[in-house]
């Protein structure tokens, strides 16, 4: 695997994609040396593709200049101005706006509660075997194990909070030293990451949009594991987070504070524990080595539970185990103690939809894992649908310039800590870091927010996420105060030497740059998105982790030469960039390699034929289902009844002919229109702005 | 009713073994501990060790040990005590002792005992 | 081993009388402790155990009190069925052991 994919027989060119600030992009394939290519991620103007739910009406234009692809879509409006328009229409088009807004706003409150139905459908399915991940006690000695395994855990449950809780709970029963939670806090940062990768994935449909939303949504990835490469090491060598984190919880004496402001769950949970409730203690207790646990189910059924306070006899193995001297007695066999058991009578159920049910929790898991991807999904079509009407014109100038402008000179390198703030601010209101970077990646993708915005945004939720940690250490019981406190501390540190790290210079942003880059080949070949959603967050994780139980021998013996090549790969590729003539003409591209190795072409033949068999078949219902099809197989023919693959194969065939982006549209309407979905007089009847 | 019945009286010569039984009825044999206690004429009581029943699972008083094994035949409700390297001071009324009362070390049902006499 | 130190080792009194026998352990040894009659030629009655918990059949002028390491048995008015040993008895540690005995007559 080449370490930049699609390099061909094209030289190193650093200046192809220029993004201001980020500094210099990921070399690109020069198009005219590929002609041939049915493909049109990075491609001149001749070959904008045509949006795949589309119609196959092929809108002529002249050639214009080639466009930096992660430029912003500008979406004209061609509706009728406010000022033109009668009584009639502006009443109309006022309860249109506000139509539009509520069924935002609705399908932003169901995409936000099938996020949370996201994650606890991971946590059955995957939650026991996240908690026994736990339960292995060579995390004390290796902070890469713990790495892992906190990135593991908190991609099986989908949710930072829950593995960092276990590390708490474990930390506070002495089952674990901070020293060794640290490295899995980590890796809870990188896991909780992957939720905005999987709602990229739905953006699909549309290359440059898809491009946008999984660039945008990777930074986040990239700007965790980065971080990771260079403080895990440093806090294994100086352990700087355990040292500041121990002296600031030792300088203060805290009292016990309030539970951290639930205000988002406010308003989603009445919907979401309708459909499942959880005992999110078993995980823990799983993690804890409790084998009464693991035969548990975690789906919650009983909600109003009387606890009642006995004594009862038990054996004990020695006097020396009894719970006091005078609590100790024999039977002239067995030496008998009495203990205090809490007896848990059951008065009323939880009134949930699989209360009574009493499937097993995989299967409940499973149900749940794909009503809530196709919810996720469908919500964020509409979303986008809904925002894509709404934001032309006027109204997206406006959004855009708020967003995306920085402040007059000399202030302009504010705004992006103001950004940080934000986005801190914002996570901190929803409670969730997934959610803030989920709700950005759509907005992304449609072009409202560009990548080196969402970038400071999502730093921003990261120090959220971890203030809200914070308050939740403070509310934390005495026992727990100061372990929770201090994990929760190491968490926000860790993220401010990140942004340390990869902010303030903007050479350093590396994670834009990357991301770009993953962007491109993603838009390019989309079933390189799932491989690297696969690899990143399971196999590489998994065989670390497989290699960490065989021993630190074995984990050396495979990872130095690993590492060692990456490394090599990555001089070699800086110097092929910057100062080729030092190379040997051989190694001043990659054409040493064999193609397999150096582009991702050959793979996608193989790609291709694997999925060709699930071509005919993979979706001929609805667009929904296209886009999850097209992700898969990246296929032409695909979708049969919604045409939108076919209508892109059309568009690929003419390559000749300049085809109109659906970004170009003067309006939505147009390219329903050229659908049939809509009479072509209604075109006039659009309404423009809220 | 409960009832334990004991073996006759027996007369041994010093380091000579001695096998005394306990037949039990009137209660689930299984469920409860039986006790061996023994009396010297004129002294207090001794306890010698106890058996489990169920599991067949023993524990003996440190003093007897290696010297005294309890041993029990379910199929006849039947519980064993056996003393070997008799010696004079070992010649006294041995008696079963039944512990109805679950958990506890107290013994609710006696045996009538059985005198073992040591003498040469 | 815990040692049970009982005192009197004997007592003569009248019928009707107050009697108190106590027993003393060597160790704290909670409430885990029983009384047992014996009458001369017979086998040991539990009388009490769990300190002051009645046996089953057990007459109400028997009564016991105590923890830790001192412990009573009382009859509170001695019947001439009463005439015989006790032994009281601790059952916190293995081994089960017995005090000397209280020999109670009736003059």
């Known amino acids: 695997m080449a370490p930049w994919p699609e390099l061909g027989d094209a030289q190193p060119n650093p200046d192809k994609y220029l993004e201001g600030a980020a500094g210099q992009q990921p070399t690109a394939p020069d198009k005219s040396k590929e002609t041939n290519k049915t493909d049109n991620t990075e491609a001149p103007v001749t070959k904008i593709e045509l949006l795949p739910s589309y119609s196959t009406a092929t809108l002529i234009d002249e050639p214009t200049e080639v466009d930096d692809p992660w430029n912003l879509p500008t979406l004209q409006d061609s509706g009728i101005k406010w000022s033109e328009r009668d009584t009639k229409g502006k009443i109309l088009c006022f309860f249109q706006g506000i139509g539009r807004l509520i069924l935002l706003l609705g399908f932003l409150y169901f995409f936000v509660c099938s996020l949370d139905i996201l994650s606890s459908a991971f946590q059955l399915v995957g939650g026991k075997m996240a908690g026994q991940f736990f339960s292995n006690s060579s995390i004390m000695s290796n902070p890469l194990l713990g790495l892992v395994i906190g990135v593991l855990v908190t991609v099986l449950v989908q949710s930072s909070s829950t593995s960092t809780s276990i590390v708490v709970s474990m930390v506070s029963s002495s089952l674990l030293t901070v020293r060794a939670a640290i490295p899995i806090i980590m890796g809870a940062n990188i896991g909780t990451s992957i939720t905005n990768t999987i709602v990229a994935l739905m953006q699909v449909g549309d290359r440059s949009e898809f491009r946008r939303a999984f660039a945008g949504a990777t930074v986040h990835d990239f700007f965790n594991w980065l971080s990771v490469l260079v403080l895990l090491p440093v806090e294994v060598a100086t352990h700087y987070l355990e040292i500041i984190t121990q002296l600031i919880v030792e300088s203060f004496h805290f009292k016990n504070g309030e539970d951290a402001p639930d205000l988002l769950k406010v308003i989603t949970k009445p919907f979401t524990k309708l459909i499942v409730q959880l005992d999110k203690k078993v995980i823990s207790q799983i993690a804890m080595n409790d084998e009464k646990a693991k035969n548990k189910s975690l789906v919650k059924i009983w909600c109003k539970t009387f606890t009642n306070k006995t004594q009862i006899n038990v054996t004990v193995p020695s006097t020396a185990n009894c719970t006091s001297p005078s609590l100790c007695w024999t039977d002239g066999i067995q030496n008998w103690t009495m203990k205090n058991v809490t007896y848990k009578e059951n008065i009323a159920k939880c009134q949930h939809i699989f209360v009574n049910f009493h499937l097993p929790d995989l299967a409940v898991g499973t149900i749940l894992l794909i009503l809530s991807l196709l919810v996720l999904c469908g919500c964020l079509i509409m979303i986008v649908k809904i925002l894509g009407s709404v934001l032309k014109g006027q109204v997206a100038t406006v959004i855009k310039k708020t967003i995306n402008t920085d402040f007059p000179f000399p202030f302009a390198w504010l705004t992006g800590y103001l950004a940080i703030l934000v986005g801190a601010g914002m996570t901190f209101i929803v409670q969730s870091s997934s959610v803030f970077t989920s709700a950005l990646t759509p907005l992304i993708g449609i072009g409202v927010i560009t990548i080196e915005r969402a970038y400071p945004l999502t730093l921003g939720s990261n120090i959220g996420t971890t203030t809200t940690a914070i308050l939740a250490a403070l509310a934390s019981p005495g026992n727990a105060l100061r372990s929770s406190l201090q994990i929760a501390l190491c968490h926000f540190f860790f993220n401010i030497s990140g942004i340390l790290l990869w902010y303030p210079i903007p050479f350093t942003r590396l994670p834009i740059r990357m991301a770009k880059g993953l962007g491109n080949i993603s838009a390019k070949y989309r079933w390189f998105a799932v491989f690297y959603l696969i690899i990143f967050f399971f196999l590489i994780p998994l065989t670390v982790f497989g290699l960490s139980l065989a021993g630190w021998r074995v984990l050396v013996g495979v990872g130095v030469p690993v590492v060692f090549i990456i490394i090599l790969v990555l001089c070699l590729r800086l110097l092929q960039s910057r100062c080729p003539r030092v190379l040997p003409k051989k190694l001043q591209n990659w054409n040493f390699l064999p193609l397999w190795m150096r582009s991702l072409k050959p793979w996608d033949a193989v790609v291709s034929k694997f999925t060709g068999c699930f071509q005919m078949r993979c979706c001929c219902c609805c667009r929904v289902c296209c886009r999850a099809c097209c992700l898969l197989c990246d296929c032409p023919k695909c979708c049969r009844c919604s045409k939108c693959c076919e209508d892109l194969e059309e568009a690929q065939e003419g390559q000749d002919v300049p085809v109109k982006a659906p970004e170009t549209f003067d309006n939505i309407t147009i390219s329903r229109e050229a659908q049939g979905e809509v009479p072509a007089s209604d075109s006039k009847t659009e309404c423009t702005a809220l | 009713q409960v009832q334990l019945v004991q073996s006759g009286a027996e007369v041994k010569k010093p380091g000579a073994s001695v096998k005394v039984s306990c037949k039990a009825s009137?209660?689930?044999?299984?469920?409860?501990?039986m006790h061996w206690v023994r009396q010297a004429p004129g002294q207090g009581l001794e306890w010698m060790g106890a058996?489990?029943?169920?599991?067949?699972?023993?524990s003996y008083n440190q003093k007897f040990k290696g010297r005294v094994t309890m041993t029990r035949d379910t199929s006849t409700s039947t519980v064993y005590m056996e003393l070997s390297s008799l010696r004079s001071e070992d010649t006294a009324v041995y008696y079963c002792?039944?512990?109805?009362?679950?958990?506890?070390?107290?013994?609710?049902?006696w045996g009538q005992g059985t005198l073992v006499t040591v003498s040469s | 081993d815990i040692q049970m130190t009982q005192s009197p080792s004997s007592l003569s009194t009248s019928v009707g009388d107050r009697v108190t026998i106590t027993c003393k352990a060597s160790?704290?040894?909670?409430?885990?402790v029983a009384w047992y009659q014996q009458k001369p030629g017979k086998s040991p009655k539990l009388l009490i155990y769990?300190?002051?918990t009645r046996h089953t059949g057990v007459p109400s002028r028997f009564s016991g009190s105590g923890s830790g390491t001192d412990f009573t048995l009382i009859i509170s008015s001695l019947q001439p069925e009463d005439v015989a040993t006790y032994y009281c008895q601790q059952y916190s540690r293995i081994p089960l052991t017995f005090g000397g005995g209280t020999k109670v007559e009736i003059k």
């Open positions: 058996i489990y029943p169920g599991s067949g699972d023993t």
């Open positions: 160790q704290d040894v909670g409430t885990a």
């Open positions: 769990w300190t002051s």
């Open positions: 009137g209660y689930t044999f299984i469920t409860y501990n």
């Open positions: 002792a039944s512990s109805t009362i679950i958990t506890t070390g107290a013994v609710d049902y």
